[in-house]
């Protein structure tokens, strides 16, 4: 299953499959997730080691048993790959690192006014993988405001150095935020020239294209079909690059297919997995296990559940079958692709779905009225769980926020439905940033069921929580995916990085905002909160957040929206915007429904009809 816990001051011994430099443990974990054989990783921050060569070292590891011995190492951080973690699998990494210079091949230098502008330039440059920006206070005046666009053979920095007044980060192309746009066409009987960066075997051009998309240096590809004249080159997928970023020439060639990486697509990228099953095809590779199962789909599920399995072949040969069950060969290779592809066989083959980010039809947990005042504009994909709950009577308007917690589930505040319990009047918009982008043609979700907490009473602040079951499940994308829930009764975690988001009023007597707002707000203890609200009972099922001096808060129209906190690199839904005395008033924190206290209720209500809890636990 999915394991998300990080081990501090611990280093996994042995099992090394690759090493690289990364700016933090989360980026190291992402590289492990996308490496075909990596199950575990260890990261050495600059503070953890004197050896300059090993600072920022990210060590990717494999293990036949799925685990390795941990040794104590002060400052080291270790953890697991996020393979099998559904919607948490993403190559998108937005963080900007202050005080570090990520080294690589500098191929473009320009003057820009901010690090965000530098990141945007990198994202809009086809070859840029990461960048460094010298701030206005950089010690050498001639380098100030310099934006250096960079690449490297592996897509990660060739070195990382601590350097004051320098900020570094990665291209946001994997976040589907590139302005370049992409070529979706696949060209038959055409071969591209230029530099081959890798060679893998694939069953069709679509798998070849997906592998190209997620390869750090592939910009385009040529695939040799299963009837290519040279037998040894059949099913070869050549991943390619060029100085210009486009093929310098193409040659008409029977039984070849060429196309482009989809990394520069805007708003949608292919999933980093291959779900199709190929009848009449055998995939060769290193044998991991052989098991008898009923049907090729069960074989694929078996492969997906066995974390080291990369691909499989389900044999229909009479000698491989007993009654209704046949042999399911679970296999792997060094690069994650078959070492041999044979056609015209009595097998069916396919790939593990361990990197599919759609996950199952579940809500996500982890084991470990009231707009935003004093906030700033959010950007695309920053809060992909945020939804807008709108009511369509004669006109249509935004009333509340909500949080996507599963393909078919939204968590919000019960008081949003005061006087409006009819599910037909509600429209739920997900994957949006600007309310003004909503037109009559914008897709929305309708409500199948509104589940208000049984102990909620109108005009009381208690149990202000409601679940919405959508009529149809939503697909996950970089702009529309769920927030993980905390574990039941989560009281031990100290959250220091919490944000509230919404389209609500920007002042007490204001109006709904167009662009989704965000504000960073500290949590306040319940004791402190109770002192500020002596006329109300602040229960253990509430959580408060706000600045003593006021000025930043949720407000009308934010109700039902998320209070999220980042812990160990993962966002969790800590609270649901519920109530407060006015908005952003001095010594009047906002009050939120404490989600951890309602986990049993959420799990009970989101159980599927067959009684199986629709939960996906990354721990």
């Amino acid at each position: 299953g999915c394991l998300t816990q990080l081990y501090e001051n611990a280093f996994f011994r042995g099992g090394d499959v690759a090493s690289m430099y990364t700016p933090n443990a989360q980026y190291c974990q992402m590289r492990c997730t996308f490496h075909p054989r990596c199950l575990l990783f260890s990261f050495l921050p600059a503070s953890s080691i004197n050896d300059m060569e090993k600072r920022f070292g990210c060590f990717l590891k494999d293990s036949v048993t799925g685990t390795l011995p941990k040794v104590h190492r002060t400052g080291a951080v270790s953890g697991h790959s996020l393979k099998q973690c559904g919607h948490q699998i993403s190559a998108c990494h937005r963080d900007i690192y202050k005080g570090v210079d990520m080294r690589g091949v500098n191929f473009n230098v320009s003057k820009v006014s901010s690090v965000e502008e530098c990141q945007k330039r990198c994202t809009s440059n086809i070859r840029c993988q990461f960048f460094s920006y010298a701030t206005q206070t950089f010690h050498k005046a001639e380098y100030r405001n310099n934006c250096l666009l960079k690449y490297s053979p592996g897509g990660t920095p060739t070195a990382i150095k601590v350097l004051s007044n320098v900020e570094s980060g990665f291209s946001l192309k994997p976040c589907a935020l590139s302005e370049i746009g992409c070529h979706m066409n696949i060209f038959q009987h055409l071969a591209f020239s230029d530099v081959d960066v890798a060679r893998v075997l694939t069953p069709d051009a679509f798998v070849c294209r997906t592998i190209c998309t997620y390869h750090p240096n592939c910009l385009f590809f040529t695939f040799y079909t299963n009837v290519w004249k040279i037998e040894s080159q059949r099913n070869v997928c050549l991943l390619k690059t060029s100085e210009s970023g486009t093929p310098s020439s193409s040659t008409p060639q029977e039984n070849t297919i060429s196309g482009y990486s989809l990394l520069t697509c805007k708003r949608t990228l292919p999933e980093p997995c291959h779900s199709k099953i190929y009848p009449g095809v055998d995939f060769g590779g290193e044998e991991l296990n052989v098991t008898f199962v009923k049907g090729v789909n069960v074989c694929q599920e078996t492969c997906t559940k066995m974390i080291r399995c990369q691909f499989f072949t389900y044999s229909l040969l009479p000698e491989d079958c007993k009654e209704e069950k046949c042999k399911c060969f679970l296999r792997l290779s060094m690069d994650g692709s078959p070492t041999r592809i044979a056609y015209g066989t009595q097998g069916s083959s396919g790939y593990s779905l361990r990197l599919c980010n759609t996950g199952d039809n579940s809500v996500c947990t982890t084991k470990t009225s009231t707009r935003i005042v004093g906030g700033t504009n959010s950007s695309w994909g920053e809060w992909p769980w945020q939804v807008s709950l709108q009511v369509k009577l004669t006109a249509q308007r935004h009333l509340c926020g909500g949080s996507l917690i599963g393909h078919q589930w939204v968590l919000t505040a019960a008081h949003c439905f005061d006087g409006l319990p009819l599910q037909d009047v509600w429209r739920i918009y997900s994957g949006i940033l600007n309310l003004s982008d909503i037109t009559k043609d914008t897709p929305f979700s309708q409500i199948k069921e509104i589940i208000i907490h049984q102990n909620y009473k109108v005009s009381e602040g208690n149990h202000d929580i409601a679940l919405i079951k959508l009529q149809a499940p939503l697909n996950y994308t970089e702009f529309q995916k769920p927030i993980c829930l905390p574990s039941k009764g989560d009281t031990s975690t100290i959250y220091t990085n919490c944000w509230v988001t919404g389209w609500g009023f920007s002042k007490e007597k204001g109006e709904i905002q167009n662009i989704l707002q965000k504000v960073n707000i500290p949590l306040v203890t319940n004791e402190e909160c109770q002192k500020r609200y002596q006329d109300y009972k602040i229960t253990q099922r509430m959580v408060c957040a706000g600045y003593k001096e006021g000025g930043k808060d949720a407000c009308k129209g934010d109700s039902g929206g998320p209070l999220v906190c980042k812990h160990n690199g993962m966002w969790r839904l800590v609270g649901i915007t519920s109530w407060g005395e006015g908005c952003a008033r001095r010594e009047q924190p906002g009050v939120y429904t404490k989600v951890a206290e309602y986990m049993d209720w959420i799990l009970e209500k989101t159980q599927s009809s067959d009684g199986k809890a629709q939960m996906q636990s990354p721990a």
Epitope: A205, F206, P279, G280, L317, T358
Partner: antibody, heavy 120, light 107 residues
């Protein structure tokens, strides 16, 4: 020239049997998975059956499972569909089709079709 | 089985008009979606494979887009020879299924 040519259609009574053939030419037949697709008069396309290149694996639409059998003879470059226990709703034009596998099972080669009428 | 829906079921447009047909699948199929054109009394003809790639020999006025569950076939400038019925088909998982079809006529 790549070609598929169906034959064997005709009028048959409910409960009767019929065997359709599809002769392939112009390509290496044994490399390709083959399909039967049908179309009832005035209606849409319905996938009927599929056979692996080797003939070792087959698949059927629920509507024909247990009554129809797909087979192939790679030495004769021919695909077959044995249809038993025919019903009025099996009345359709039957097409054989194949996919140049690397197009992801898009059917880029089709026959001209053969008409099967089930009526008393 | 993967269910397919197509809209509209029929349309009538003038020569030179842009025509759009949509296809929706009951589950995600990546880009394993194909479009066919069928003229009366003829076998279907592959137009677009892999959601967006033009089959060789097909005029460039035909284009396809989409991934996951929502797909579109666009004819940028309708010609008299484009009259016929258009079908989408998923080739992601067996049984392969077709949409119910969209009949295109010229006004």
């Amino acid at each position: 020239e790549v070609q598929l040519l169906e034959s064997g259609g005709g009028l048959v009574q409910p409960g009767g049997s019929l065997r359709l053939s599809c002769a392939a030419s112009g390509f290496t037949f044994s490399w390709y998975p083959m399909q039967w697709v049908r179309q009832a008069p005035g209606k849409g396309l319905e996938w009927v059956s599929y056979i692996y290149p080797s003939g070792g694996g087959t698949d059927y639409a629920d509507s024909v499972k247990g009554r129809f059998t797909i087979s192939r003879d790679n030495s004769k470059n021919t695909l077959y569909l044995q249809m038993n226990s025919l019903r009025a709703e099996d009345t359709a034009t039957y097409y054989c089709a194949t996919s140049s596998g690397w197009l992801g099972d898009a059917f880029d080669i089709w026959g001209q079709g053969t008409m099967v009428t089930v009526s008393s | 089985d993967i269910q397919m829906t197509q809209s509209p079921s029929s349309l009538s447009a003038s020569e030179g008009d842009m025509v759009t047909i949509t296809c929706r699948t009951s589950r995600r199929i990546g880009t394993y979606l194909n479009w066919y054109q069928q003229k009366p009394g003829k076998a279907p003809k592959l137009l677009i494979y892999g959601a967006s790639s033009l089959q060789s020999g097909v005029p460039s006025r035909f284009s396809g887009s989409g991934s996951g569950t929502d797909f579109t076939l666009t004819v940028s400038s309708l010609q008299p020879e484009d009259v016929g019925t258009y079908y989408c088909q998923q080739s992601f998982s067996s049984p392969w299924t077709f949409g119910p079809g969209t009949k295109v006529e010229i006004k």
